[in-house]
Every structure is written in structure tokens, then in C-alpha cells.
């Protein structure tokens, strides 16, 4: 039959950070092409990445419609040049992905310290509220707007001259910490969703230190 050399996709894997979501799979195609379908548990299948030779498909546009829904994808394999061909059961070979719930599973991207400002013995540290690809009323929502209070940030800070780290946490994107006058401090932040069971934490942000351009000092 026309499907003799067609193999089903395998190792279907969701790769998602801040809701940018790509489905990846194997194998690299030899004389075959792929089409991906995605649906919610209760919805209809929607086809994406038609007859592609890629082994990935960007499904962001679909999952951002409702990030709290649970999605399932499947990858169909077709013989190259004969995409009408079906398998022995009368339909093309396909493989299902694991279920994926973006709100609960998307990785938290590496945060960025937007600014820090010293006033006397206090430093205000602000974390950049990164835009996601989730849309509402035509505008892209920030990470905070999507996750609300489910998202907290942890600040790690230490004197430039020592290695002993202190921490602070916040339900917003701002910290206000006490520092010793005349000392320079370094900062790093991490995004955390404490209520999650997987992918709870981001990687740490790049370290920013006082005495560099990003900060501001006021007596």
C-alpha cells in the first residue's frame, strides 16, 4: 500500500515558555510529511502545519485562546507526494500528544530586573512585567495580568563584597529592601507559581549590581 514506508510520529513533546508553545516530535521525515491537529477536550480538531517536513509546529495561536483549557494534539504522517493515502484502517497514521494545560504547565521565562533605585537605606527593585502572547480585547497581556496572584517573585540579594544571600518575596513586581549605607548590592530574581506541581520556578534572572547603569541612587 501507499503507506508502507510511512512511520508514525513519536516522542511528541510540548515546549512552552510564557505561553509561546511548540509541539515537537520525531522522527525527521524520510519520504513523508506531517500535519498536526489540536483540540480541547470538548472541542473540534483544528489542523495546523499542513503537510510539513518540519518536526515541530507552533500552536501558540490556538492555546492562547484559553490558557486554562486542557489541549490534546495529534500528528498525522502521510507519504510524501501522496497525502491522500491512508493506512490499513482507512485513515492516516497518527500519534497523540500528552495532554497540555498551558496555565498549569507553561515554563516561566527567565525574568529581568527592570530597575533598582536606592533612597537612603532602602532599595526599590522592580521586575519587568513581560508581555505574553495571550490576548484580551486585542492587546497582549503581561505575565502578571495572566497569572495574577498565582505568580510571586523571589528576590535574592547580597553585598557585592560577600556571598551571604538574603531573600525577599512579593505578590507584585516590586520589592523594597533594607540595605546598609555605603554598601553595593547585587540582585537576582526568580518567578515562582507556588500552587503548581510542575514547572514551579523560572531560572534566575541575570544578576544586576549597584554601581552599574541600571540603578539609580538618591540620598
Amino acid at each position: 500500500s501507499g503507506t508502507t514506508n510511512t512511520v508514525a510520529a513519536y516522542n511528541l513533546t510540548w515546549k512552552s515558555t510564557n505561553f509561546k508553545t511548540i509541539l515537537e516530535w520525531e522522527p525527521k521525515p524520510v519520504n513523508q510529511v506531517y500535519t498536526v491537529q489540536i483540540s480541547t477536550k470538548s472541542g473540534d480538531w483544528k489542523s495546523k502545519c499542513f503537510y510539513t517536513t518540519d518536526t515541530e509546529c507552533d500552536l501558540t495561536d490556538e492555546i492562547v485562546k484559553d490558557v486554562k483549557q486542557t489541549y490534546l494534539a495529534r500528528v498525522f504522517s502521510y507519504p510524501a507526494g501522496n497525502v491522500e493515502s491512508t493506512g490499513s484502517a482507512g485513515e492516516p497514521l497518527y500519534e497523540n500528544s500528552p495532554e497540555f494545560t498551558p496555565y498549569l504547565e507553561t515554563n516561566l521565562g527567565q525574568p529581568t530586573i527592570q530597575s533598582f533605585e536606592q533612597v537612603g537605606t532602602k532599595v526599590n527593585v522592580t521586575v519587568e512585567d513581560e508581555r505574553t502572547l495571550v490576548r484580551k480585547n486585542g492587546t497582549f497581556l503581561t505575565l502578571r495580568q495572566v497569572f495574577g496572584k498565582d505568580l510571586i517573585y523571589t528576590l535574592y540579594y547580597w553585598k557585592s563584597s560577600s556571598s551571604g544571600k538574603k531573600t525577599a518575596k512579593t505578590n507584585t513586581n516590586e520589592f523594597l529592601i533594607d540595605v546598609d549605607k555605603g554598601e553595593n548590592y547585587c540582585f537576582s530574581v526568580q518567578a515562582v507559581i507556588p500552587s503548581r506541581t510542575v514547572n514551579r520556578k523560572s531560572t534566575d534572572s541575570p544578576v544586576e549590581c549597584m554601581g552599574q547603569e541600571k540603578g539609580e541612587f538618591r540620598e
Epitope: L141, G148, A168, T170, N171, F175, I177, S195
Partner: antibody, heavy 125, light 108 residues
Framework: QVQLQESGPGLVKPSQTLSLTCTVS?????????WSWIRQHPGKGLEWIGE???????RYNPSLKSRVTISVDTSKNQFSLKLSSVTAADTAVYYC??????????????????WGKGTTVTVSS | EIVLTQSPGTLSLSPGERATLSCRAS???????LAWYQQKPGQAPRLLIY???SRATGIPDRFSGSGSGTDFTLTISRLEPEDFAVYYC?????????FGGGTKVEIK
Amino acid sequence: QVQLQESGPGLVKPSQTLSLTCTVSGGSISSGQYWSWIRQHPGKGLEWIGEIYYSGSTRYNPSLKSRVTISVDTSKNQFSLKLSSVTAADTAVYYCARDTPYYYDGGYYYYMDVWGKGTTVTVSS
Amino acid sequence: EIVLTQSPGTLSLSPGERATLSCRASQSVSSSYLAWYQQKPGQAPRLLIYGASSRATGIPDRFSGSGSGTDFTLTISRLEPEDFAVYYCQQVGVVPYTFGGGTKVEIK
């Protein structure tokens, strides 16, 4: 200063949907606070129902989640509560409240610092 | 869910006396997420203490909060006539946010 005012029917029939609106005056609903609904059964303690951010991000009490919808209308400076399939057990005083960030120990945490006066809802046929 | 148990249920005291109210959590609560409210009959609750120990705006310094982990305390150093009310503790760290059952402070 910010004031909150609940409005909606005081009497709802069993199995119907309870609908309440909270109007925010003296400030913008989009100003970085969260907006909550809390209820108090007659002579009893307080029960948190859920909250919403101006962006529409919500959190609900799991015990009510299947029946509750909280929504926000930034153009009207209002947020609303819908509670479906009500029974006599939903008879209570319903409060709306503002959840605003307070500084504590290096960070900011949200507390319910402004409340509406409350509206009594009775579920009865 | 985190259950908050308040004791005593009722506290009968005279004006000028000291009131000590307890709130015990079924599991550890970060101090950052613990609040106390006062409620008078026919009125909405009023935020007194946040972060377990910080007074909200306009709250007299006779009100103080303390504690950590699972045990928290609200103290009213000298009761004024307007302090007779019901007091609730609340945790806002874990959904669902929960309130204690309340302690009624009544005039003896």
C-alpha cells in the same frame, strides 16, 4: 477615597442564578488591585468566594468553583458575581472588597482593605 | 484548605482591660499572609492588622499582632468602648483564602 457599593436582587428563587454587581467609585478598577467577593451566612463567619484582577485573571474558592463566575467591566468600573443553581444555603450577606498591596518584609502582599456595606440575598421560593 | 481556629469563642472583659485573641492554623502560614479584621453588628469587616503584625492605616496602636507559623495572636492593650466587636483572622496565602470562626469581645 475608594468606595464600593453592591447591588442586585435581594430575593432569588432556588435553582436560579444569583447576580450581583459591585460599583467602584473614587478610583479606577484598573489600578493594580484585585477585587473580591465574600459572603457571610446569617449569624456565621466569613467565606471567601473569589477574586478578579482587572485583566480578567480569576481565583475561586474550590467549594464554589463549579457555580461561580466573577467578571469585570473596566468601562463601567464594576465587577460582578454570578452564582448558579442556588439553594437556601446560599442565603447570606454578600460583600465586595478591594484587595490592595501592602508593604511587608521586603515585598508587597494583598489584603482586603476596603469593603462594601454588604447586600442581603435570600434564596426562597 | 487551611483551617483557622480562633479561641476563645467569646471574651467577656471590661473597658480598660487587655484582650488576647488566638488564631491557630491547621498548617503553617507565612506571616506575610495573615490578617486580622474587626466587625461590628450590621457593618462590613475592617482591616486591622496585615502581615501578622503591621497595623493598617488609621488603626490605633492599642491593637497589635504577633505570631508565626501556626500560632498568631491579636492583642488589644486597653479596651475602649468601641472595641467591643467580633474579630476574625484570615490567611491569604493559599486558595481558598480562609477566615477563622471569629472571637466575640463583649462587655462584661
